[in-house]
Amino acid sequence: APRGTQAEESPFVGNPGNITGARGLTGTLRCQLQVQGEPPEVHWLRDGQILELADSTQTQVPLGEDEQDDWIVVSQLRIASLQLSDAGQYQCLVFLGHQNFVSQPGYVGLEGLPYFLEEPEDRTVAANTPFNLSCQAQGPPEPVDLLWLQDAVPLATAPGHGPQRNLHVPGLNKTSSFSCEAHNAKGVTTSRTATITVLPQQPRNLHLVSRQPTELEVAWTPGLSGIYPLTHCTLQAMLSDNEVGIQAGEPDPPEEPLTLQASVPPHQLRLGSLHPHTPYHIRVACTSSQGLSSWTHWLPVETPEGVPLGPPENISATRNGSQAFVHWQEPRAPLQGTLLGYRLAYQGQDTPEVLMDIGLRQEVTLELQGDGSVSNLTVCVAAYTAAGDGPWSLPVPLEAWRPGQAQPVHQLVKETSAPAFSWPWW
């Protein structure tokens, strides 16, 4: 570091003074020198090191007409916003000829009210749930003692006696405010006031009570909500998407869920207008005057299969001698599940109804044995799923086949081991 020499008399006629103050202070240090001839550049040192980027000014005033006469040089150093790193010993430095000269030192010190490095933050917590708050302050002067306050009431008898940097709160049953006071020899600084909002706890034990093809009944156990009664609970249902999938506890679903509000109590809700035989995910959160609890994890549920809601369509039944041809189309109405097959019912005017399971085929050829003289034959068809049979079609009379009518090649239905045809057996 540059070091002044005393071989010649110092040119400095004014030395930097002292500044002590709080963070953020704007201060100016000055030095003044009188030199003969060309005025030198004035440099500033802090703790013996040149300040390369010093915010300094320099004024040069000639004391005579000639450039070789004496000059007064004034240099000012600006400290725009005093920080701890600015504290130290300051000197002016000039190079004159082959010598350097330094002024007498001035001192910059930081001393004021405590300064917060960390303050308590607003947050939400579930009722009766432990949490921590942080507060940190520094001087100088040190030491800095902290005093926590809850709803403006000190939590200790004196600064430094209670918890310091971290305050552990075992739980709250009402929304409260917290702040901390920092005390040092200069006085007291109060932190911002953090509002800790008490929300209901996350509901527990979300489960299915009953299942119908288009509705699910669910129930849950509410969490504690402190002094604030629950106003309602909100249930969200989401079609399960195999592509995306809903992770357990994922905060937001990938698409807009169906959202329903439930009055409480009871902590139960019927979800209607659902798709049968469809996987869903559901979750629930409850609300008090203070806000919404956290959501439960997504619970996978599934609506059961239902029976088809309509009969098969476009049933056609024709008879040609000893054969009957019946064909139909899948019901237009929702199947409410996986179609397992069709049942066909056949009945004559004075004969009992006979049921057949056709499987998944949509046409059948019936081999009528005997003279086929049974009168007023009618056919009904119903679709079925694992949940049961859907509604039967209206009876379709078996019409005689007329030449010119198309006659498709049909699957014969005939049990070879069955006895010879004798109504009502096929």
Epitope: N18, S56, T57
Partner: antibody, heavy 125, light 107 residues
């Protein structure tokens, strides 16, 4: 005699730009900090920013940061205020002022001892 | 930013009256306070710096006092040329801030 003279004010549309000059005489710009202060019609004084002409360092009020730039040319003994992205709320008389901070070895704070006559900037469509 | 609150915002006084204007800082500003006088259509003029130091050329009827957060400008005997608006300004921290002004009018 110490004197500061502003120029460059006028009418400008919102979003427009204007450059104000502050010509100093009777003292060297290098020896002090130069401040810009504005005063909206019928209102009080508002600090805009300062420059150290010797080093070129400048500080700004939050309300103008990123839009205004203060510079200086010590050879011309003149400071400048470049105003971009002007808004209606920038309408004011703009003053430049020299900082006075005494002659002791140190001081806390400062005052402004010489002010220009002011130049009116009107931002309106 | 530090707020500077001046009171009163205006006052009426007669020539020869003693006038006191106060300025309160929102936090400690030591003695880094200046006072200015401004007349309509003119630039402000420095009266007092460092809370209590009279700027050169300013009549001695003007005086300033205070430290910390409370500051006072006093005109011991109001003269006709003193009817103007007066501003306090703190420069303890950046940005420097001004009071809203006190208008001194003729009663």
């Amino acid at each position: 005699e110490v004197q500061l003279v502003e120029s460059g004010g006028g009418l400008v549309q919102p979003g427009g730009s204007l450059r104000l000059s502050c010509a100093a005489s009777g003292f060297s710009l290098s020896g002090s900090w130069i401040h810009w202060v504005r005063q909206a019609p019928g209102k009080g004084l508002e600090w805009v920013g300062w420059i150290n002409p010797y080093r070129g360092y400048a500080y700004y009020a939050d309300s103008v940061k990123g839009r205004f730039t203060i510079s200086a040319d010590t050879s011309k003994n003149t400071a400048y205020l470049q105003m971009n992205s002007l808004r209606a709320e920038d309408t004011a008389v703009y003053y430049c002022a020299r900082e006075y901070s005494g002659w002791g070895g140190s001081s806390v704070g400062y005052a402004m001892d010489y002010w220009g006559q002011g130049t009116l900037v009107t931002v309106s469509s | 930013d530090i707020q500077m609150t001046q009171s009163p915002s205006s006052l009426s006084a007669s020539v020869g009256d003693r006038v006191t204007i106060t300025c309160r800082a929102s936090q400690d500003v030591s003695t880094a306070v200046a006072w200015y006088q401004q007349k309509p259509g003119k630039a402000p003029k420095l009266l007092i710096y460092s809370a209590s130091f009279l700027y050169s050329g300013v009549p001695s009827r003007f005086s300033g006092s205070g430290s910390g957060t409370d500051f006072t400008l006093t005109i011991s005997s109001l003269q006709p040329e003193d009817f103007a608006t007066y501003y306090c300004q703190q420069s303890y921290t950046t940005p420097p801030t001004f009071g809203q002004g006190t208008k001194v009018e003729i009663k």
